[in-house]
Amino acid sequence: MSITGISPITEYLASLSTYNDQSITFALEDESYEIYVEDLKKDEKKDKVLLSYYESQHPSNESGDGVDGKMLMVTLSPTKDFWLHANNKEHSVELHKSEKPLPDQAFFVLHNMHSNSVSFESKTDPGVFIGVKDNHLALIKVDSSENLSTENILFKLSETHHHHHH
């Protein structure tokens, strides 16, 4: 599953919430970031995440004609130089400081099971998605395409504005 371009084809600054409208928030604690899933008070500001979209060749098509079989990969960065990473050993989602080129653990395949929601599949562990578990983000194994509609792996993006990259 190779990324076809070094720079993203588009970027959005958006707040991220669960299917049940809980907010994904990021807090700096002891020099590392914690990720929380919580209900915000009415006037509380939502944290924003920079989503960078990359084109990627689908593995089954890499030897094909290249016309078909593209996927969108995203990286998610809530603050400068920090990106969400999949820790497949611990089944956890963590924020790590990284330099570009980002490691594969920072890339997630974008799914739209519904037009108004997205899911993020780990590039390094196909079939494993970012999901909500005990008010935290975790990696959740989805065993069949029917289960892709499970609410705990569905997220909503509330776009705040376009991010102009060069």
Epitope: M71, H111, S149
Partner: antibody, heavy 122, light 107 residues
């Protein structure tokens, strides 16, 4: 290669319904969103709506809610659109389209069927 | 809904000319813009997506540019087969909307 083959032209009476098909081949049907687009002399190109065969989820342009119904038959990799309560305003060419990306709708139309001409006339 | 306005409505050009057409969005759409070419009796064909990305198989004489509300499609050294209608379309967000088109004809 990727193909979207649409059903033939239809002449229908006002008030009636019409159901058109879009038979696909050359790709994994369930993994791509399929959109429908209307082209008429009066209003140019208009997006009607989209459907994801995997989940059956759909999404419509408000202007076509109640007018268009989108369905799929996964066993034959075919998408369908039914238009109801037809008037002369519905006379147009209707295209089925598919985006460039697995799993994701960016509402980009990379592949198009040849179009189905619908004429509403008494 | 965001309105996409294309200009000019039509243009008459000669083979070898460099041609630029415009598309204006009524609100900021970032780089969420596609361009299509449609020849008489044919279905539209995707040329450019995300404002400046040439789709697979599209000749490199076609170039997209712009960001926010103002976009351009340039054809360098127009060929006879480029005579067609060209449409811009706002992508990514629902509902996507199309411009009214620019007709490019050969002198």
């Amino acid at each position: 290669q990727v193909k979207l083959l649409q059903s033939g032209a239809a002449l229908v009476k006002p008030g009636a319904s019409v159901k058109m098909s879009c038979a696909t081949s050359g790709f994994s049907f369930t993994d791509y969103w399929v959109s429908w687009v209307k082209q008429s002399h009066g209003k140019g190109l208009e997006w009607i709506g989209e459907i994801y065969p995997n989940s059956g989820a759909d999404n419509f342009n408000e202007n076509f809610k109640g007018k268009a119904t989108l369905t799929v038959d996964k066993s034959t990799s075919t998408a369908y659109m039914e238009l109801s309560r037809l008037t002369s305003e519905d006379s147009a060419i209707y295209y089925c389209t598919r985006g460039p990306y697995y799993y994701s709708t960016q509402i980009i139309f990379a592949y198009w069927g040849q179009g189905t001409l619908v004429t509403v006339s008494s | 809904n965001i309105v996409m306005t294309q200009s000019p409505k039509s243009m008459s050009i000669s083979v070898g000319d460099r041609v630029t057409m415009n598309c204006k969005a009524s609100q900021n759409v970032g780089n969420n813009l596609a361009w299509y070419q449609q020849k008489p009796g044919q279905s539209p064909k995707l040329l450019i997506y995300y404002a400046s990305n040439r789709y697979t198989g599209v000749p490199d004489r076609f170039t997209g540019g712009g960001y926010g509300t103002d976009f351009t499609l340039t054809i360098n050294s127009v060929q006879a087969e480029d005579a067609a209608f060209y449409y811009c379309q706002r992508i990514y967000n629902s509902p996507p909307t199309f411009g009214g088109g620019t007709k490019v004809e050969l002198r």
